[in-house]
Interface confidence: medium
């Protein structure tokens, strides 16, 4: 969640078993800081739907009071519903709650198309279906918002697992992980596995079907094939990481790598799409649009407002490139590169005009704020923030979407020269936030 | 232009109530936060009461805690500020503030503009 | 609460003379800091916000500066329209928000 640019989630949500999935393979154990191997307890903990937000079950208070939270890697607060909202089932009570703690301190948090307001607070937080602790966290209830909610997303607040630098009001707030690893045993790491379905899902199939999982502390080895790869963590505030090259259907698009991370390139389960910086998202689809030129679609669909629909079962997928993006690695002058299918930058939604056909919306959109890896990717792979070791694995995930021609990819290692000039640096003025009044 | 005028002060009994209200105009009311300040005679400023833009989100000083109520009604670009259990020691002009958006925790926030007031009191 | 310390509470000074208001927040308030005018039997009016941004239509002999605890009002050269008092005001923490005590500006 970049604040200036964009709402919480728009993601594509997973269900049981969809489309052709990979076999597990064997790999070779990583020496990993967190837990290895099997965390039944937290797999298939995430629900949510094209779009609209990948979610956790959460309980907040003393007795617990049940919210359902968006998850995202893009914004540091944990902010939840604590007024009734139009678009909210239900929301945080906090007279409810004998353990609330007023911080008599508000946080207001500006989006690009939306925006909230709130009362700063600690209240003891828990994840029934995570570690099996409970901790005293920040909370920033939620009191007046503006195209914020999503109608219809079944998730009442929003969980930034992202660094304290890009906490509001100030960086003092310690977001919900830190406090998570201070208080408890649990390691300083956590793995998302995000599922897109492949296809639009209705409500009452949104709540039946299985999102993803978000295992806290650790690595679950049956959510991934093949092996991890690790990219740096350039900076501890949103999840960056740098691009080093970018290919489409193995053509390099041949840019100055400066480009690809220009202002930054983020990992961000709270926004739907691939964003690209202007200069790279116009030389993509250029390419893309020559790969799969043997249709001509409207100008409207590369601008992510028009749909495109097939037939029932006939979308052409093989018109389509693949994506790579080189990411740099671990060691000097290693690369790895990870590679997305038209599966997961084409995104289903629901036309409502003809429902026997399949549409799907162009997830690839332009962005003045660097490069946003959003559901698009990340549907793709398995993703472990490994904050303990200032570093993000990929690996392709067990639950994504393909076809029996092509699946999506992790390999390496790829020789790269002057990665660290990939990096843009921004310059550091006086960020004075921009005033606007109070009652 | 921006405009804001306060309505129905008086002269009440300790223990009785009032209810002032506060008539906008030359801006788009529900996109605005609103407060209520007071001023008793010879003293200095205190807030009262704030509202969100929308109503769903209401504050008071520990002075006028559930004595008081804010509200609006956005349909007639009105505030409002019911006023219970009156005290001598809530004599004062009442002023209507008008915020500089919907929010009342954007960073760096003001009064702007102020009715005239109106001016209640409280005494036997 | 954050408690808002204004001095002096009155001053008396001539025109053309530089006068300086100070304010003191009890813990840190960042920039959240506004500053008002208000002449006898009228409406207080919004001078400076944000520590230092002028509001428009105010003169340009008010400016205003300060952050963390420490603020300060400055009228480089007093006007005979600017004998009145003035009030700083916090707006960083949640409500009740709270003013200061005032400073009254007097002719010598």
């Known amino acids: 969640t970049q604040h200036g640019i964009r709402l919480p989630l728009r993601s594509g949500l997973g269900g049981a078993p969809l489309g052709l999935r990979l076999p597990r393979e064997t790999d070779e154990e990583p020496e990993e800081p967190g837990r290895r191997g099997s965390f039944v307890e937290m797999v298939d903990n995430l629900r949510g739907k094209s779009g609209q937000g990948y979610y956790v079950e959460m309980t907040v208070g003393s007795p617990p009071q049940t919210l359902n939270i968006l998850v995202d890697t893009g914004s540091s607060n944990f902010a939840v519903g604590a007024a009734p909202h139009p678009f909210l089932h239900r929301y945080y009570q906090r007279q409810l709650s004998s353990t609330y703690r007023d911080l008599r301190k508000g946080v207001y948090v500006p989006y690009t198309q939306g925006k909230w307001e709130g009362e700063l607070g600690t209240d003891l937080v828990s994840i029934p279906h995570g570690p099996n602790v409970t901790v005293r966290a920040n909370i920033a209830a939620i009191t007046e918002s503006d195209k914020f909610f999503i109608n219809g997303s079944n998730w009442e607040g929003i969980l930034g697992l992202a660094y304290a630098e890009i906490a509001r009001p100030d960086d003092s707030l310690e977001p919900f992980f830190d406090s998570l690893v201070k208080q408890t045993h649990v390691p300083n790491l956590f793995s998302l596995q995000l599922c897109g379905a492949g296809f639009p899902l209705n409500q009452s199939e949104v709540l039946a079907s299985v999102g993803g999982s978000m295992i806290i502390g650790g690595i679950d080895h049956s959510l991934y094939t093949g092996s991890l790869w690790y990219t740096p963590i350039r900076r501890e505030w949103y999840y960056e990481v740098i691009i080093v090259r970018v290919e489409i259907n193995g053509q390099d698009l041949k840019m100055d790598c400066k480009e690809y991370n220009y202002d930054k390139s983020i990992v961000d389960s709270g926004t739907t799409n691939l964003r690209l910086p202007k200069k790279v998202f116009e030389a993509a689809v250029k390419s893309i649009k020559a790969a799969s030129s043997t249709e001509k679609f409207p100008d409207g669909f590369w601008l992510g407002e028009q749909l495109v629909c097939w037939q029932a079962g006939t979308t052409p997928w093989n018109i389509f490139p693949v994506i790579s993006l080189y990411l740099m690695g671990e060691v000097t002058n290693q690369s790895f590169r990870i590679t997305i299918l038209p599966q997961q930058y084409l995104r289903p939604v629901e036309d409502v005009a003809t429902s026997q056909d399949d549409c799907y919306k162009f997830a690839i959109s332009q962005s003045s704020t660097g490069t946003v890896m959003g559901a698009v990717i990340m549907e793709g792979f398995y993703v472990v923030f490994d904050r303990a070791r200032k570093r993000i694995g990929f690996a392709v995930s067990a639950c994504h979407v393909h076809d029996e021609f092509r699946t999506a990819a992790v390999e390496g290692p790829f020789v790269t020269l002057d990665m660290e000039d990939c990096g843009y640096n921004i310059p550091q003025t006086d960020e004075s936030t921009l005033m606007t009044g109070r009652a | 232009e921006v405009q804001l005028l306060e309505s129905g002060g008086g002269l009440v009994q300790p223990g009785g109530s009032l209810r002032l209200s506060c008539a906008a105009s030359?801006?788009?009311?529900?996109?605005?936060?609103m407060s209520w300040v007071r001023q008793a005679p010879g003293k200095g400023l205190e807030w009262v009461s704030a509202?969100?833009?929308?109503?769903?989100?209401?504050y008071y000083a520990d002075s006028v805690k559930g004595r008081f109520t804010i509200s609006r009604d956005n349909s007639k670009n009105t505030l409002y500020l019911q006023m219970n259990s009156l005290r001598a020691e809530d004599t004062a002009v009442y002023y209507c503030?008008?915020?500089?958006?919907?929010?009342?925790?954007?960073?760096?926030?003001?009064?702007?503009?102020w009715g005239q007031g109106t001016l209640v009191t409280v005494s036997s | 609460d954050i408690q808002m310390t204004q001095s002096p509470s009155s001053l008396s000074a001539s025109v053309g003379d530089r006068v300086t208001i100070t304010c003191r927040a009890s813990?840190?308030?960042?920039?959240?800091l506004n500053w008002y005018q208000q002449k006898p039997g009228k409406a207080p009016k919004l001078l400076i916000y944000?520590?230092?941004s002028l509001q428009s239509g105010v003169p340009s002999r008010f400016s205003g500066s300060g952050s963390g605890t420490d603020f300060t009002l400055t009228i480089s050269s007093l006007q005979p329209e600017d004998f009145a008092t003035y009030y700083c005001?916090?707006?960083?923490?949640?409500?009740?928000?709270?003013f200061g005590g005032g400073t009254k500006v007097e002719i010598k």
């Open positions: 503030a008008k915020g500089g958006s919907q929010w009342l925790y954007a960073p760096g926030s003001w009064f702007d503009p």
């Open positions: 030359g801006f788009t009311f529900s996109s605005y936060a």
């Open positions: 509202i969100s833009g929308s109503g769903g989100s209401t």
């Open positions: 813990q840190s308030i960042s920039s959240y």
């Open positions: 944000a520590a230092s």
């Open positions: 005001d916090e707006s960083y923490s949640t409500p009740p928000w709270t």
